[in-house]
């Protein structure tokens, strides 16, 4: 339950956070769709992957993503009033050796091939305080979330806590 002013307050803590252990606490395959039920799909084009947000035809199969969940411990804030904060972070891999990355300079979400240990750009803080939807906040750029812009995934700066409920940064996870 960590909205925008909380995110900004935790800028330092997010950057300082370390993934506890190299193993995820859990992993599973799920299809990713937007709040408005458009599917996130991945297509190999010219030896690189493109990410699309689109309506699927009735019997078209949804692409699956491997979600790997990690715990991240960060120091408690400047007030020094006790327990460290435990965050839940996620990496998203639609195909072997490729992971979603935040490109903060271009405000884009890209698929990069890389080996473990994964770079920080591949980690997203998971938010699920909006009923059964989730949001993905960049570990490398607190207050910036994966969102939908012009039928593509993009990085979207969220500047007030109310905007955490904005539909374009909310996603649904489904096993079907």
């Amino acid at each position: 339950a960590f909205g925008i002013s909380g995110v900004q307050k935790y800028t330092r803590a997010l950057h300082d956070s370390s993934i506890t252990g190299i193993s995820p606490i859990t992993e599973y395959l799920a299809s990713l769709s937007t709040y408005n039920d458009q599917s996130i799909t991945f297509a190999l084009e010219d030896e690189s992957y493109e990410i699309y947000v689109e309506d699927l035809k009735k019997d078209e199969k949804k692409d699956k993503v491997l979600l790997s969940y990690y715990e991240s411990q960060h120091p408690s804030n400047e007030s020094g009033d006790g327990v460290d904060g435990k965050m839940l972070m996620v990496t998203l891999s639609p195909t072997k050796d490729f992971w979603l990355h935040a490109n903060n300079k271009e405000h884009s979400v890209e698929l990069h091939k890389c080996e473990k240990p994964l770079p920080d750009q591949a980690f997203f803080v998971l938010h699920n305080m909006h009923s059964n939807c989730v949001s993905f906040e960049c570990k490398t750029d607190p207050g910036v979330f994966i969102g939908v812009k012009d039928n593509h995934l993009a990085l979207i700066k969220v500047d007030s806590s109310e905007n955490l409920c904005t539909e374009n940064i909310l996603f649904k996870l489904s096993e079907t």
Epitope: A1, F2, G3, S5, G6, K9, Y10, I25, T26, Y28, Y69, S76, N77, S79, D81, G82, V83, G85, K86, M87, L88, V125, L126, H127, N128, M129, H130, S131, N132, E137, S161, E162, L164, C165, E175
Partner: antibody, heavy 122, light 107 residues
Amino acid sequence: QVQLVESGGGVVQPGRSLRLSCAASGFTFSSYGLHWVRQSPGKGLEWVALISYDGSNKYYADSVKGRFTISRDNSKNTLYLQMNSLRPEDTAGYFCAKSLYTTSWYGGFDYWGQGTLVTVSS
Amino acid sequence: DIQMTQSPSSVSASVGDRVTITCRASQGIRSWLAWYQQKPGKAPNLLIYAASSLQSGVPSRFSGSGSGTDFTLTISSLQPEDFATYYCQQANSFPPTFGPGTKVDIK
């Protein structure tokens, strides 16, 4: 260490109101989602309500929707539950609980208060 | 809402016994399941989260397993302080829901 201390319980007649409080210490209060969970005497646990870190998101169990209001005062490190139009079936021990993770309730509730008893009876 | 069921509803065991409690969800909840221990007059205490992660400070004789709809809590060697009621809770879909509890008492 983390402490959550509830207060405000008591005996109340059906249709009346009661306000519960939960005073928190030992963690960064303003960064966590908080919950109310209740337990009827000799029975199991029932989740009642959730409030996000800054109070902008609130969710309720169907059984209390429209009657109960969850709120928080981050300057006082205190969580509240305003209970209106109380019914005999609301009789229970009420616990406040903290989410394990800062941004998610996937991990369950890692710290609980000792509970405060609410009895609704004429 | 997702319904959670537990079995058995109660179990009598002796110190040193291996005790297994099962929890079933009415639909898939991935690995988002927590287990709590509650003693009379006390608040619940988180033992296991994410189906198999041991909460800090909890003895290693407690372990959890499972994913999807079927989950297990195992106490490898029951200790006197383990006699209590155990609840599972799904944390995957809103609203969070609890199982009815399993009471572990002295044989």
